[in-house]
């Protein structure tokens, strides 16, 4: 166990052109506060994925009012450290998100308004017990300077806070089987300390923080007796005493969620749905009021004037969770076309298009008519990932470069003879038929089935098809 500590040194305009406007004004004075979110490992997770290592909110900074005409200075900061306690081993590699929030103190209906000013994120390696690490991160035109460290809480020591040390009981040496605790040579490695709450009767451990169950007991703290009354639904190892299969422990056995939280299994472990007033991986963080700004992503906090009364976060569209900390999966609707990959950036959806496609939703087919010409007066028609030319009469082929034989398809009906012509084809109709393709019979009485032929054309005359 231990604590991650974050010290904010400054938040203000970064170097270079385009200094940001001050977030506060004489009409709308404001103050800053910070939120840190920690996750184990070096994964590039979305901002709204759970803060599995923990999260913390700072106090509010001093009220700031912009001085007219003055450039935006470094803004006044809250006092003190942001501290994120961690219960288990320090992972050594971690991802962080630090959000800078503005609380506007003007005449807001329904209390102060919060808005996110900047969010920085990074992935770092850090050994517990080491010195403060300094960092500078930029978010747009803003710059955040900060330091951080991880320290172990006694009796834990070491780079992962997994070794446990106690003061020596005798001046000269440690107890049987226990070594001196370097670098604290005046202390000794302590006996293993199992996970907090691990049943002393039914549980044991071989690693610090572990809780392994004796046969017949289950749950994260080995407090749940395994039922042997029914052996109808096996899912675990065989019990030596009864000879029947008993359920193996699931991640929600014994309900790891505190304060009335409900547990649901996930592919990797479990997730707690916390009641109002509680949050954290196991719903262990409480005593939060609306003054602490528990609603993220622009959520509106209602109630919760004191730590004993619950608050409710009214989330803006697209956000959910008891603290509006989770984003709705908009990419599940698959808005990207033509096999594009959807990315939800929070403020907008982005599509990463496959080769040959472009546009905000990959709707433009680059393989189509862009830069393609159809020869000999042909026109390009888009469709289906490949361009196609609609050729002028007398031409064919993919790009209308081939001279076509207009008579190849035998276009003249009823035995009419076809003649190729520079502007198309001409049908010479057999007696008794007329029309551009000899398609109309001439009635025995001399009248055609359609309006009379144009002047100068007799039935049987060749007719040119334009």
């Amino acid at each position: 166990a231990g604590v991650f500590e974050l010290q904010i040194h400054s938040f203000g305009p970064g170097p270079g052109p385009g200094a940001p406007r001050s977030p506060c004004s004489a009409r709308l004075p404001c103050r800053l506060f910070f939120r840190v979110c920690l996750k184990p490992g070096l994964s590039e997770e979305a901002a709204e994925s759970p803060c599995a290592l923990g999260a913390a909110l700072s106090a509010r900074g001093p009220v700031y009012t912009e001085q007219p005409g003055a450039p935006a200075p470094d803004l006044p900061l809250p006092d003190g450290l942001l501290q994120v306690p961690f219960r288990d081993a320090w992972p050594g590699t971690f991802s962080f998100i630090i959000e800078t929030w503005r609380e506007e103190l003007g005449d807001q209906i329904g209390g102060p308004a919060w808005s996110l000013l900047a969010r920085v994120a990074g992935r770092r390696r850090l050994a517990a017990g080491g010195p403060w690490a300094r960092d500078i991160q930029r978010a747009g035109a803003w710059e955040l300077r900060f330091s951080y460290r991880a320290r172990c809480e006694p009796p834990a020591v070491g780079t992962a806070c997994t070794r446990l040390c106690r003061p020596r009981s005798a001046p000269s040496r440690c107890g049987p089987g226990l070594r001196p605790c370097a670098p604290l040579e005046d202390e000794c490695e302590a006996p293993l300390v199992c996970r907090a709450g691990c049943s002393p009767e039914h549980g044991f451990c071989e690693q610090p923080g572990e809780c392994r169950c004796l046969e017949g007991w289950t749950g994260p703290l080995c407090t749940v007796p395994v039922s042997t009354s029914s052996c109808l639904s096996p899912r675990g190892p065989s019990s030596a005493t009864t000879g029947c299969l008993v359920p193996g422990p699931g991640p929600c056995d014994g309900n790891p969620c505190a304060n009335g939280g409900s547990c649901s299994e996930t592919p990797r472990s479990f997730e707690c749905t916390c009641p109002r007033g509680f949050y954290g991986l196991r719903c262990e963080v409480s005593g939060v009021t609306c003054a602490d700004g528990p609603c993220f992503n622009g959520g509106l906090c209602v109630g919760g004037a004191d730590p004993d009364s619950a608050y409710i976060c009214h989330c803006p569209p697209g956000f959910q969770g008891s603290n509006c900390e989770k984003r709705v999966d908009r990419c599940s609707l698959q808005p990207c076309r033509n096999g594009g990959l959807c990315l939800d950036l929070g403020h907008a959806l982005r599509c990463r298009c496959r080769a040959g496609f472009a546009g905000p939703r990959c709707e433009h087919d680059l393989d189509d008519c862009a830069g393609r010409a159809c020869a000999n007066g042909g026109t390009c028609v888009e469709g289906g990932g490949a361009h196609r030319c609609s050729c002028a009469l007398g031409f064919g082929g993919r790009d209308c470069r081939e001279r076509a034989d207009p008579c190849a398809a035998r276009p003249c009906a009823h035995g009419g003879r076809c003649y190729a012509h520079f502007s198309g084809l001409v049908c010479a109709c057999a007696p008794g038929y007329m029309g551009a393709r000899c398609e109309f019979p001439v009635h025995p009485d001399g009248a055609s089935a359609l309006p009379a032929a144009p002047p100068g054309l007799r039935p049987g005359d060749p007719q040119r098809y334009l």
């Epitope: 697209g318 808005p335 959806l349 939703r361 990959c362 709707e363």
Partner: nanobody, 119 residues
Framework: EVQLVESGGGEVQPGGSLRLSCAAS????????IGWYRQAPGKQRDLVAG???????TYAESVKGRFTISRDNAKNTVYLQMSSLRAEDTAVYYC?????????????WGQGTLVTVKP
């Protein structure tokens, strides 16, 4: 700005049916993708059914064979026909759409309509 207005929610017995409607209104917009999400108390908001950007219908596994999504392009309306309803279908159902306005795409949510399935 595009408005999405849902209707058709209500209380129904297990095994019963309901038809939800979502009407999109506004000026000079075209719908790229549109569908239905639902959120049960204390749970995440998840996609139920929708028309993707490619115009293909997509369904959550839990509703396949029971729910059918359809659309009337002339009315800019999408429907969700829900049959063989179960208690676990109880939720607020939200219409959502990815909409092109001018050259930009924006995401819009409706206010939601409550569906309650109980004996």
């Amino acid at each position: 700005e595009v408005q999405l207005v849902e209707s058709g929610g209500g209380e129904v017995q297990p095994g019963g049916s309901l038809r939800l409607s979502c009407a999109a209104s506004g000026s000079d917009f075209s719908i790229n993708a549109i569908g239905w999400y639902r959120q049960a108390p204390g749970k995440q908001r998840d996609l139920v059914a929708g028309f993707t950007g490619d115009g293909v219908t997509t369904y959550a596994e839990s509703v396949k064979g029971r729910f059918t999504i359809s659309r009337d392009n002339a009315k800019n309306t999408v429907y969700l026909q829900m049959s063989s309803l179960r208690a676990e279908d109880t939720a607020v159902y939200y219409c959502a759409a990815d909409v092109k306005i001018g050259g930009d795409y924006e995401w819009f949510w409706g206010q939601g309509t409550l569906v309650t399935v109980k004996p």
